[in-house]
Protein backbone atom coordinates (compact mmCIF):
# COMPACT_ATOMS: atom_id res chain seq x y z
CA UNK A 1 0.00 0.00 0.00
CA UNK A 2 1.64 3.22 -1.19
CA UNK A 3 1.05 6.40 -3.14
CA UNK A 4 1.80 6.64 -6.84
CA UNK A 5 5.28 8.10 -6.94
CA UNK A 6 5.64 10.92 -9.42
CA UNK A 7 2.26 12.60 -9.70
CA UNK A 8 1.69 16.14 -8.52
CA UNK A 9 -1.29 15.49 -6.31
CA UNK A 10 -3.95 17.95 -7.42
CA UNK A 11 -7.39 18.47 -5.95
CA UNK A 12 -8.17 22.01 -7.12
CA UNK A 13 -11.11 22.53 -9.46
CA UNK A 14 -13.09 25.51 -10.70
CA UNK A 15 -14.37 27.41 -7.68
CA UNK A 16 -12.04 25.69 -5.21
CA UNK A 17 -8.38 26.08 -4.36
CA UNK A 18 -7.20 22.79 -2.82
CA UNK A 19 -3.98 20.95 -2.00
CA UNK A 20 -3.29 17.27 -1.20
CA UNK A 21 -1.07 16.50 1.78
CA UNK A 22 0.24 13.33 3.41
CA UNK A 23 -1.63 12.54 6.58
CA UNK A 24 -0.91 10.66 9.79
CA UNK A 25 -4.56 9.48 9.77
CA UNK A 26 -5.07 11.53 12.94
CA UNK A 27 -6.53 14.88 12.02
CA UNK A 28 -6.16 17.79 14.42
CA UNK A 29 -9.95 18.05 14.74
CA UNK A 30 -9.95 14.77 16.70
CA UNK A 31 -7.88 16.46 19.40
CA UNK A 32 -9.46 19.92 19.16
CA UNK A 33 -13.13 19.41 18.28
CA UNK A 34 -15.04 22.18 16.51
CA UNK A 35 -18.60 23.22 17.25
CA UNK A 36 -19.75 23.28 13.65
CA UNK A 37 -18.86 20.34 11.43
CA UNK A 38 -19.91 19.32 7.92
CA UNK A 39 -22.16 16.39 7.04
CA UNK A 40 -20.84 13.13 5.57
CA UNK A 41 -20.13 12.44 1.89
CA UNK A 42 -23.22 11.51 -0.11
CA UNK A 43 -21.82 8.66 -2.17
CA UNK A 44 -18.47 6.95 -2.57
CA UNK A 45 -17.61 5.22 -5.81
CA UNK A 46 -14.52 3.02 -6.05
CA UNK A 47 -13.15 1.29 -9.06
CA UNK A 48 -9.89 -0.14 -10.25
CA UNK A 49 -7.61 1.75 -12.54
CA UNK A 50 -4.17 0.98 -13.96
CA UNK A 51 -1.52 3.72 -13.93
CA UNK A 52 2.12 3.88 -14.86
CA UNK A 53 4.85 4.86 -12.43
CA UNK A 54 7.78 7.11 -13.30
CA UNK A 55 9.79 3.93 -13.94
CA UNK A 56 7.24 2.84 -16.53
CA UNK A 57 5.70 0.10 -14.42
CA UNK A 58 1.97 -0.54 -14.70
CA UNK A 59 0.38 -0.69 -11.26
CA UNK A 60 -3.19 -1.16 -10.03
CA UNK A 61 -4.59 1.90 -8.29
CA UNK A 62 -7.88 2.66 -6.59
CA UNK A 63 -9.96 5.37 -8.22
CA UNK A 64 -11.98 6.96 -5.42
CA UNK A 65 -14.79 9.39 -6.18
CA UNK A 66 -17.31 10.98 -3.84
CA UNK A 67 -19.91 13.73 -3.90
CA UNK A 68 -21.12 16.25 -1.33
CA UNK A 69 -24.58 16.55 0.12
CA UNK A 70 -26.43 19.69 -0.93
CA UNK A 71 -26.82 21.22 2.50
CA UNK A 72 -25.50 24.33 4.22
CA UNK A 73 -22.83 22.37 6.07
CA UNK A 74 -20.51 22.69 3.09
CA UNK A 75 -19.87 26.19 4.38
CA UNK A 76 -17.98 24.54 7.25
CA UNK A 77 -16.17 21.94 5.14
CA UNK A 78 -12.43 22.53 5.38
CA UNK A 79 -11.28 19.43 3.56
CA UNK A 80 -11.36 15.63 3.60
CA UNK A 81 -9.26 12.77 4.86
CA UNK A 82 -8.99 9.71 2.62
CA UNK A 83 -7.98 6.51 4.34
CA UNK A 84 -7.24 3.12 2.80
CA UNK A 85 -6.97 0.11 5.10
CA UNK A 86 -5.60 -3.20 3.81
CA UNK A 87 -7.78 -5.68 5.66
CA UNK A 88 -5.43 -8.65 5.96
CA UNK A 89 -2.48 -6.63 7.32
CA UNK A 90 -4.24 -3.68 9.02
CA UNK A 91 -1.86 -1.39 7.14
CA UNK A 92 -3.37 2.06 6.68
CA UNK A 93 -2.48 4.94 4.38
CA UNK A 94 -4.06 8.39 4.50
CA UNK A 95 -4.01 11.65 2.56
CA UNK A 96 -5.70 14.93 3.36
CA UNK A 97 -7.47 17.28 0.98
CA UNK A 98 -6.94 20.76 2.39
CA UNK A 99 -9.33 23.40 1.06
CA UNK A 100 -7.61 26.74 0.75
CA UNK A 101 -10.82 28.56 -0.11
CA UNK A 102 -14.41 28.33 1.08
CA UNK A 103 -16.84 26.13 -0.81
CA UNK A 104 -19.88 27.84 -2.30
CA UNK A 105 -23.01 26.28 -3.74
CA UNK A 106 -22.95 26.11 -7.50
CA UNK A 107 -25.21 24.66 -10.16
CA UNK A 108 -23.67 21.18 -10.03
CA UNK A 109 -23.11 18.89 -7.05
CA UNK A 110 -19.51 19.07 -5.81
CA UNK A 111 -17.52 15.98 -6.85
CA UNK A 112 -13.98 14.93 -5.83
CA UNK A 113 -11.66 12.21 -7.12
CA UNK A 114 -8.36 10.64 -6.10
CA UNK A 115 -6.50 7.93 -8.03
CA UNK A 116 -3.12 7.58 -6.36
CA UNK A 117 -3.45 4.69 -3.92
CA UNK A 118 -1.35 1.82 -5.32
CA UNK A 119 -2.83 -1.52 -4.27
CA UNK A 120 -1.98 -5.23 -4.48
CA UNK A 121 -3.70 -7.95 -6.49
CA UNK A 122 -6.20 -10.15 -4.66
CA UNK A 123 -6.39 -7.93 -1.58
CA UNK A 124 -9.40 -6.34 0.08
CA UNK A 125 -9.34 -2.71 1.18
CA UNK A 126 -11.61 -0.48 3.20
CA UNK A 127 -11.75 3.03 1.80
CA UNK A 128 -13.01 5.81 4.08
CA UNK A 129 -13.71 9.43 3.19
CA UNK A 130 -13.88 11.58 6.30
CA UNK A 131 -15.03 15.17 5.97
CA UNK A 132 -13.05 17.68 8.00
CA UNK A 133 -13.28 18.86 10.65
CA UNK A 134 -14.31 15.57 12.24
CA UNK A 135 -17.39 15.64 14.45
CA UNK A 136 -17.41 16.44 18.15
CA UNK A 137 -17.62 13.44 20.51
CA UNK A 138 -21.13 11.92 20.24
CA UNK A 139 -21.73 14.04 17.14
CA UNK A 140 -23.21 12.51 13.99
CA UNK A 141 -20.52 10.68 12.01
CA UNK A 142 -19.41 12.54 8.91
CA UNK A 143 -17.59 9.80 7.07
CA UNK A 144 -18.48 7.01 4.67
CA UNK A 145 -16.65 3.75 4.11
CA UNK A 146 -16.71 1.17 1.37
CA UNK A 147 -14.88 -2.12 0.90
CA UNK A 148 -13.22 -2.97 -2.38
CA UNK A 149 -11.72 -6.29 -3.44
CA UNK A 150 -8.89 -5.93 -5.96
CA UNK A 151 -9.13 -8.77 -8.50
CA UNK A 152 -6.41 -11.40 -8.60
CA UNK A 153 -3.93 -11.83 -11.42
CA UNK A 154 -6.29 -14.07 -13.39
CA UNK A 155 -8.35 -10.97 -14.17
CA UNK A 156 -7.68 -9.68 -17.69
CA UNK A 157 -7.03 -6.12 -16.53
CA UNK A 158 -4.68 -7.20 -13.75
CA UNK A 159 -2.70 -9.72 -15.82
CA UNK A 160 -0.70 -7.00 -17.55
CA UNK A 161 0.23 -5.09 -14.38
CA UNK A 162 3.84 -5.26 -13.26
CA UNK A 163 3.19 -7.06 -9.94
CA UNK A 164 1.18 -9.75 -11.74
CA UNK A 165 3.63 -10.14 -14.59
CA UNK A 166 6.45 -10.44 -12.06
CA UNK A 167 4.62 -13.30 -10.37
CA UNK A 168 4.11 -15.14 -13.65
CA UNK A 169 0.61 -14.06 -14.69
CA UNK A 170 1.33 -14.36 -18.40
CA UNK A 171 2.02 -18.09 -18.05
CA UNK A 172 -1.06 -20.14 -18.79
CA UNK A 173 -0.17 -23.78 -18.10
CA UNK A 174 -3.51 -25.09 -19.39
CA UNK A 175 -3.39 -28.02 -16.95
CA UNK A 176 -5.14 -31.25 -17.85
CA UNK A 177 -5.43 -34.17 -15.46
CA UNK A 178 -6.41 -37.61 -16.67
CA UNK A 179 -7.14 -40.66 -14.52
CA UNK A 180 -5.32 -43.75 -15.75
CA UNK A 181 -5.60 -47.41 -14.80
CA UNK A 182 -3.75 -48.75 -11.76
CA UNK A 183 -4.23 -45.69 -9.55
CA UNK A 184 -2.36 -43.22 -11.68
CA UNK A 185 -2.92 -39.64 -12.79
CA UNK A 186 -1.43 -38.13 -15.91
CA UNK A 187 -0.82 -34.41 -15.48
CA UNK A 188 -0.08 -32.37 -18.55
CA UNK A 189 0.79 -28.67 -18.67
CA UNK A 190 2.50 -26.12 -20.88
CA UNK A 191 6.00 -25.03 -19.92
CA UNK A 192 6.88 -21.31 -19.85
CA UNK A 193 9.73 -19.76 -21.81
CA UNK A 194 12.20 -19.81 -18.94
CA UNK A 195 14.72 -22.40 -17.90
CA UNK A 196 13.39 -22.87 -14.40
CA UNK A 197 12.18 -25.84 -12.40
CA UNK A 198 8.59 -26.60 -11.39
CA UNK A 199 7.02 -28.45 -8.51
CA UNK A 200 3.82 -30.47 -8.64
CA UNK A 201 1.95 -30.98 -5.40
CA UNK A 202 -0.67 -33.70 -5.43
CA UNK A 203 -3.10 -33.47 -2.52
CA UNK A 204 -5.82 -36.08 -2.18
CA UNK A 205 -8.97 -35.77 -0.09
CA UNK A 206 -11.79 -38.06 0.94
CA UNK A 207 -15.11 -37.43 -0.80
CA UNK A 208 -16.85 -34.39 0.78
CA UNK A 209 -14.04 -33.79 3.31
CA UNK A 210 -11.37 -31.12 3.45
CA UNK A 211 -8.58 -32.76 5.43
CA UNK A 212 -6.03 -34.31 3.13
CA UNK A 213 -5.49 -38.04 3.25
CA UNK A 214 -2.45 -38.13 0.98
CA UNK A 215 0.12 -35.65 -0.27
CA UNK A 216 2.92 -36.16 -2.75
CA UNK A 217 5.39 -33.71 -4.23
CA UNK A 218 7.09 -34.13 -7.58
CA UNK A 219 9.99 -32.06 -8.86
CA UNK A 220 10.31 -31.20 -12.54
CA UNK A 221 13.79 -30.07 -13.61
CA UNK A 222 14.29 -26.93 -15.68
CA UNK A 223 13.39 -27.51 -19.34
CA UNK A 224 15.87 -26.84 -22.14
CA UNK A 225 15.15 -23.86 -24.46
CA UNK A 226 13.84 -26.15 -27.20
CA UNK A 227 11.20 -27.39 -24.73
CA UNK A 228 9.82 -23.93 -23.94
CA UNK A 229 6.05 -23.69 -24.60
CA UNK A 230 5.89 -27.48 -25.05
CA UNK A 231 3.61 -29.77 -23.05
CA UNK A 232 5.12 -31.61 -20.11
CA UNK A 233 3.54 -34.93 -19.12
CA UNK A 234 3.91 -36.33 -15.62
CA UNK A 235 2.47 -39.63 -14.38
CA UNK A 236 1.77 -39.68 -10.66
CA UNK A 237 1.08 -42.92 -8.80
CA UNK A 238 -1.63 -42.57 -6.18
CA UNK A 239 -1.87 -44.42 -2.90
CA UNK A 240 -4.62 -46.99 -2.74
CA UNK A 241 -6.20 -45.59 0.43
CA UNK A 242 -9.81 -46.02 1.45
CA UNK A 243 -12.03 -43.24 0.12
CA UNK A 244 -9.07 -41.04 -0.79
CA UNK A 245 -10.47 -40.21 -4.20
CA UNK A 246 -10.56 -36.44 -4.82
CA UNK A 247 -7.25 -35.16 -6.14
CA UNK A 248 -5.97 -31.60 -6.41
CA UNK A 249 -2.93 -31.02 -8.58
CA UNK A 250 -1.09 -27.74 -8.01
CA UNK A 251 1.81 -26.59 -10.19
CA UNK A 252 4.28 -24.13 -8.71
CA UNK A 253 6.82 -22.50 -11.03
CA UNK A 254 10.05 -20.92 -9.80
CA UNK A 255 10.49 -18.07 -12.28
CA UNK A 256 13.44 -15.74 -11.72
CA UNK A 257 11.13 -12.76 -11.19
CA UNK A 258 9.17 -14.32 -8.32
CA UNK A 259 11.23 -17.30 -7.08
CA UNK A 260 9.21 -18.97 -4.27
CA UNK A 261 6.23 -16.62 -4.63
CA UNK A 262 5.09 -17.29 -8.18
CA UNK A 263 1.41 -17.77 -8.96
CA UNK A 264 0.37 -21.39 -8.63
CA UNK A 265 -2.15 -23.05 -10.91
CA UNK A 266 -4.29 -26.00 -9.96
CA UNK A 267 -6.78 -28.49 -11.27
CA UNK A 268 -9.03 -30.94 -9.42
CA UNK A 269 -10.23 -34.46 -10.18
CA UNK A 270 -13.50 -35.32 -8.44
CA UNK A 271 -14.31 -38.67 -6.90
CA UNK A 272 -15.79 -41.02 -9.48
CA UNK A 273 -19.53 -41.58 -9.45
CA UNK A 274 -20.30 -44.77 -7.57
CA UNK A 275 -21.28 -47.46 -10.12
CA UNK A 276 -24.20 -49.78 -9.32
CA UNK A 277 -21.83 -52.73 -9.17
CA UNK A 278 -18.50 -51.62 -7.74
CA UNK A 279 -15.45 -52.66 -9.71
CA UNK A 280 -12.95 -54.73 -7.74
CA UNK A 281 -10.00 -52.66 -6.54
CA UNK A 282 -6.58 -54.29 -6.76
CA UNK A 283 -5.66 -55.32 -3.24
CA UNK A 284 -2.05 -54.18 -3.43
CA UNK A 285 -0.42 -51.01 -4.61
CA UNK A 286 3.32 -50.51 -4.08
CA UNK A 287 4.32 -47.66 -1.83
CA UNK A 288 6.96 -46.56 -4.31
CA UNK A 289 8.18 -47.85 -7.63
CA UNK A 290 11.01 -50.16 -6.54
CA UNK A 291 14.52 -49.16 -7.51
CA UNK A 292 16.47 -52.09 -8.88
CA UNK A 293 18.31 -53.93 -6.15
CA UNK A 294 17.14 -51.61 -3.39
CA UNK A 295 14.42 -51.58 -0.79
CA UNK A 296 15.23 -48.00 0.18
CA UNK A 297 12.67 -45.19 0.16
CA UNK A 298 12.16 -43.29 -3.04
CA UNK A 299 13.82 -39.90 -2.68
CA UNK A 300 10.63 -37.97 -3.24
CA UNK A 301 7.84 -36.70 -1.09
CA UNK A 302 5.29 -38.58 0.93
CA UNK A 303 4.46 -41.86 -0.69
CA UNK A 304 3.93 -41.62 -4.35
CA UNK A 305 5.94 -42.13 -7.44
CA UNK A 306 6.15 -40.35 -10.71
CA UNK A 307 7.90 -39.93 -13.98
CA UNK A 308 7.70 -37.24 -16.61
CA UNK A 309 8.62 -36.28 -20.13
CA UNK A 310 8.16 -33.28 -22.42
CA UNK A 311 6.16 -33.43 -25.66
CA UNK A 312 7.19 -31.45 -28.72
Amino acid sequence: LRLLDHRALVCSQPGLNCTVKNSTCLDDSWIHPRNLTPSSPKNIYINLSVSSTQHGELVPVLHVEWTLQTDASILYLEGAELSVLQLNTNERLCVRFEFLSKLRHHHRRWRFTFSHFVVDPDQEYEVTVHHLPKPIPDGDPNHQSKNFLVPDCEHARMKVTTPCMSSGSLWDPNITVETLEAHQLRVSFTLWNESTHYQILLTSFPHMENHSCFEHMHHIPAPRPEEFHQRSNVTLTLRNLKGCCRHQVQIQPFFSSCLNDCLRHSATVSCPEMPDTPEPIPDYMPLWEPRSGSSDYKDDDDKGSSHHHHHH
Partner: antibody
Framework: QVQLVQSGAEVKKPGASVKVSCKAS????????ISWVRQAPGQGLEWMGW????????NYAQKLQGRVTMTTDTSTSTAYMELRSLRSDDTAVYYC?????????WGQGTLVTVSS | EIVMTQSPATLSVSPGERATLSCRAS??????LAWFQQKPGQAPRPLIY???TRATGVPARFSGSGSGTDFTLTISSLQSEDFAVYYC?????????FGGGTKVEIK
Amino acid sequence: QVQLVQSGAEVKKPGASVKVSCKASGYTFTRYGISWVRQAPGQGLEWMGWISTYSGNTNYAQKLQGRVTMTTDTSTSTAYMELRSLRSDDTAVYYCARRQLYFDYWGQGTLVTVSS
Amino acid sequence: EIVMTQSPATLSVSPGERATLSCRASQSVSSNLAWFQQKPGQAPRPLIYDASTRATGVPARFSGSGSGTDFTLTISSLQSEDFAVYYCQQYDNWPLTFGGGTKVEIK
Protein backbone atom coordinates in the same frame (compact mmCIF):
# COMPACT_ATOMS: atom_id res chain seq x y z
CA GLN B 1 22.15 -38.08 7.83
CA VAL B 2 18.48 -37.50 8.62
CA GLN B 3 17.86 -36.34 12.18
CA LEU B 4 14.83 -35.14 14.13
CA VAL B 5 15.81 -33.45 17.39
CA GLN B 6 13.06 -32.65 19.89
CA SER B 7 12.89 -30.14 22.72
CA GLY B 8 13.46 -31.17 26.34
CA ALA B 9 11.14 -32.64 28.95
CA GLU B 10 8.31 -30.50 30.37
CA VAL B 11 6.31 -30.55 33.58
CA LYS B 12 2.91 -28.84 33.35
CA LYS B 13 -0.10 -28.27 35.57
CA PRO B 14 -3.57 -29.46 34.49
CA GLY B 15 -5.24 -26.87 32.26
CA ALA B 16 -1.93 -25.50 30.98
CA SER B 17 -0.51 -25.80 27.45
CA VAL B 18 2.68 -27.35 26.15
CA LYS B 19 4.52 -26.73 22.88
CA VAL B 20 7.02 -29.35 21.73
CA SER B 21 9.47 -28.60 18.92
CA CYS B 22 11.08 -30.96 16.43
CA LYS B 23 14.06 -29.68 14.41
CA ALA B 24 14.80 -31.57 11.21
CA SER B 25 18.16 -31.82 9.45
CA GLY B 26 19.83 -33.91 6.77
CA TYR B 27 17.08 -33.58 4.15
CA THR B 28 14.85 -31.02 2.42
CA PHE B 29 12.33 -30.17 5.12
CA THR B 30 9.44 -29.25 2.82
CA ARG B 31 9.63 -32.57 1.00
CA TYR B 32 8.19 -34.71 3.77
CA GLY B 33 5.33 -34.24 6.18
CA ILE B 34 5.78 -34.47 9.95
CA SER B 35 3.58 -36.73 12.07
CA TRP B 36 3.22 -36.76 15.85
CA VAL B 37 2.78 -39.91 17.92
CA ARG B 38 2.55 -40.21 21.70
CA GLN B 39 3.08 -43.01 24.18
CA ALA B 40 1.71 -42.95 27.72
CA PRO B 41 3.91 -44.63 30.36
CA GLY B 42 3.85 -48.42 29.87
CA GLN B 43 1.30 -48.09 27.04
CA GLY B 44 1.26 -48.45 23.27
CA LEU B 45 1.65 -45.88 20.50
CA GLU B 46 -1.10 -43.39 19.64
CA TRP B 47 -1.18 -41.35 16.43
CA MET B 48 -1.94 -37.66 17.09
CA GLY B 49 -1.88 -36.07 13.66
CA TRP B 50 0.15 -34.89 10.72
CA ILE B 51 1.16 -31.61 9.10
CA SER B 52 2.35 -31.00 5.56
CA THR B 53 5.56 -29.00 5.71
CA TYR B 54 4.84 -27.75 2.19
CA SER B 55 1.19 -26.75 2.19
CA GLY B 56 0.42 -26.52 5.90
CA ASN B 57 -2.43 -29.03 5.53
CA THR B 58 -3.14 -30.84 8.77
CA ASN B 59 -5.01 -33.96 9.84
CA TYR B 60 -5.63 -34.44 13.56
CA ALA B 61 -6.89 -37.40 15.58
CA GLN B 62 -10.57 -36.86 16.36
CA LYS B 63 -10.09 -37.17 20.13
CA LEU B 64 -7.54 -34.30 20.13
CA GLN B 65 -9.43 -32.02 17.75
CA GLY B 66 -9.73 -28.54 19.23
CA ARG B 67 -6.89 -29.10 21.71
CA VAL B 68 -3.97 -29.77 19.37
CA THR B 69 -2.31 -27.47 16.84
CA MET B 70 0.55 -28.49 14.59
CA THR B 71 2.65 -25.85 12.85
CA THR B 72 5.95 -25.59 11.00
CA ASP B 73 8.62 -22.95 10.49
CA THR B 74 10.28 -23.71 7.18
CA SER B 75 12.98 -21.07 7.75
CA THR B 76 14.35 -23.15 10.64
CA SER B 77 13.14 -26.59 9.44
CA THR B 78 11.22 -27.00 12.68
CA ALA B 79 7.82 -28.53 13.39
CA TYR B 80 5.79 -27.72 16.50
CA MET B 81 3.00 -29.51 18.32
CA GLU B 82 0.97 -27.55 20.85
CA LEU B 83 -1.46 -29.31 23.18
CA ARG B 84 -3.82 -27.18 25.27
CA SER B 85 -6.03 -27.79 28.33
CA LEU B 86 -3.68 -30.50 29.54
CA ARG B 87 -5.04 -33.34 31.66
CA SER B 88 -3.21 -35.97 33.69
CA ASP B 89 -3.87 -38.58 30.98
CA ASP B 90 -1.85 -36.43 28.53
CA THR B 91 1.28 -37.48 30.44
CA ALA B 92 3.30 -39.25 27.77
CA VAL B 93 6.40 -39.28 25.63
CA TYR B 94 5.64 -37.27 22.49
CA TYR B 95 7.45 -38.25 19.28
CA CYS B 96 7.71 -36.45 15.97
CA ALA B 97 8.26 -38.68 12.95
CA ARG B 98 8.93 -38.01 9.29
CA ARG B 99 6.29 -38.76 6.64
CA GLN B 100 2.54 -38.83 6.51
CA LEU B 101 1.47 -42.45 6.50
CA TYR B 102 4.45 -44.58 7.39
CA PHE B 103 7.17 -43.15 9.63
CA ASP B 104 10.76 -43.70 8.50
CA TYR B 105 12.61 -41.46 10.98
CA TRP B 106 11.67 -40.58 14.56
CA GLY B 107 12.71 -37.93 17.06
CA GLN B 108 14.15 -39.04 20.39
CA GLY B 109 10.90 -38.19 22.19
CA THR B 110 9.87 -35.50 24.68
CA LEU B 111 8.44 -36.48 28.04
CA VAL B 112 5.52 -34.26 29.07
CA THR B 113 4.35 -34.75 32.64
CA VAL B 114 1.01 -33.27 33.67
CA SER B 115 0.69 -33.09 37.41
CA SER B 116 -0.82 -30.75 39.98
CA GLU C 1 -11.57 -46.39 13.06
CA ILE C 2 -9.65 -49.54 12.17
CA VAL C 3 -8.71 -51.57 15.26
CA MET C 4 -5.40 -53.42 15.12
CA THR C 5 -5.06 -56.48 17.38
CA GLN C 6 -1.68 -58.06 18.04
CA SER C 7 -1.09 -61.52 19.42
CA PRO C 8 0.31 -62.86 21.55
CA ALA C 9 0.77 -60.03 24.04
CA THR C 10 4.01 -61.67 25.17
CA LEU C 11 6.14 -64.18 23.30
CA SER C 12 8.89 -66.10 25.11
CA VAL C 13 11.55 -67.38 22.72
CA SER C 14 15.07 -68.69 23.09
CA PRO C 15 17.89 -67.03 21.15
CA GLY C 16 18.36 -68.68 17.74
CA GLU C 17 14.72 -69.74 17.56
CA ARG C 18 12.07 -68.48 15.16
CA ALA C 19 9.51 -65.92 16.35
CA THR C 20 6.15 -65.38 14.65
CA LEU C 21 4.12 -62.30 15.58
CA SER C 22 0.55 -61.77 14.41
CA CYS C 23 -1.40 -58.62 13.65
CA ARG C 24 -5.07 -58.56 12.70
CA ALA C 25 -7.07 -55.58 11.35
CA SER C 26 -10.77 -55.12 12.06
CA GLN C 27 -11.26 -54.51 8.32
CA SER C 28 -9.10 -54.87 5.23
CA VAL C 29 -6.12 -52.53 5.11
CA SER C 30 -4.87 -53.87 1.79
CA SER C 31 -1.06 -53.99 2.17
CA ASN C 32 -0.85 -50.64 3.93
CA LEU C 33 0.82 -51.99 7.05
CA ALA C 34 4.09 -51.28 8.84
CA TRP C 35 6.01 -52.97 11.67
CA PHE C 36 8.14 -51.17 14.27
CA GLN C 37 10.53 -52.37 16.96
CA GLN C 38 10.84 -50.48 20.25
CA LYS C 39 13.32 -50.98 23.06
CA PRO C 40 12.90 -49.42 26.52
CA GLY C 41 13.69 -45.70 26.58
CA GLN C 42 14.08 -45.53 22.80
CA ALA C 43 11.97 -44.31 19.89
CA PRO C 44 10.35 -46.91 17.64
CA ARG C 45 12.51 -48.18 14.79
CA PRO C 46 10.94 -48.94 11.38
CA LEU C 47 11.30 -52.55 10.24
CA ILE C 48 8.76 -53.26 7.50
CA TYR C 49 6.46 -51.15 5.31
CA ASP C 50 3.89 -52.14 2.69
CA ALA C 51 3.43 -55.35 4.71
CA SER C 52 6.54 -57.03 3.34
CA THR C 53 9.23 -54.52 2.30
CA ARG C 54 12.18 -54.22 4.66
CA ALA C 55 13.23 -50.72 5.68
CA THR C 56 16.80 -49.51 5.14
CA GLY C 57 19.39 -51.34 7.23
CA VAL C 58 17.00 -53.97 8.57
CA PRO C 59 18.58 -57.46 8.69
CA ALA C 60 17.22 -60.16 6.39
CA ARG C 61 16.09 -62.28 9.37
CA PHE C 62 13.07 -59.92 9.64
CA SER C 63 10.30 -60.60 7.14
CA GLY C 64 6.70 -59.49 6.82
CA SER C 65 3.79 -61.14 5.06
CA GLY C 66 0.04 -60.92 4.66
CA SER C 67 -2.54 -58.60 3.16
CA GLY C 68 -6.14 -57.64 3.84
CA THR C 69 -6.73 -58.31 7.54
CA ASP C 70 -4.06 -60.82 8.61
CA PHE C 71 -0.37 -60.02 8.84
CA THR C 72 2.70 -61.74 10.22
CA LEU C 73 6.15 -60.55 11.26
CA THR C 74 8.68 -63.36 11.33
CA ILE C 75 12.12 -63.23 12.93
CA SER C 76 13.86 -66.30 11.55
CA SER C 77 16.60 -66.65 14.17
CA LEU C 78 16.33 -64.42 17.21
CA GLN C 79 19.43 -62.50 18.24
CA SER C 80 19.92 -60.99 21.67
CA GLU C 81 19.32 -57.47 20.27
CA ASP C 82 15.89 -58.52 18.94
CA PHE C 83 14.25 -58.78 22.36
CA ALA C 84 11.92 -55.80 22.37
CA VAL C 85 8.31 -54.74 21.85
CA TYR C 86 6.95 -54.92 18.27
CA TYR C 87 4.07 -52.79 16.97
CA CYS C 88 2.08 -53.02 13.76
CA GLN C 89 0.47 -49.91 12.25
CA GLN C 90 -2.09 -49.51 9.46
CA TYR C 91 -2.04 -46.53 7.12
CA ASP C 92 -4.91 -47.52 4.87
CA ASN C 93 -7.40 -45.17 6.50
CA TRP C 94 -7.46 -42.21 8.85
CA PRO C 95 -6.98 -42.14 11.75
CA LEU C 96 -3.77 -44.12 11.56
CA THR C 97 -3.83 -46.83 14.24
CA PHE C 98 -1.30 -49.05 15.99
CA GLY C 99 -1.66 -52.48 17.49
CA GLY C 100 -1.20 -52.87 21.24
CA GLY C 101 2.23 -54.45 20.81
CA THR C 102 3.85 -57.84 21.29
CA LYS C 103 6.67 -58.14 23.80
CA VAL C 104 9.33 -60.63 22.70
CA GLU C 105 11.24 -61.80 25.77
CA ILE C 106 14.02 -64.28 26.42
CA LYS C 107 12.78 -67.73 27.36
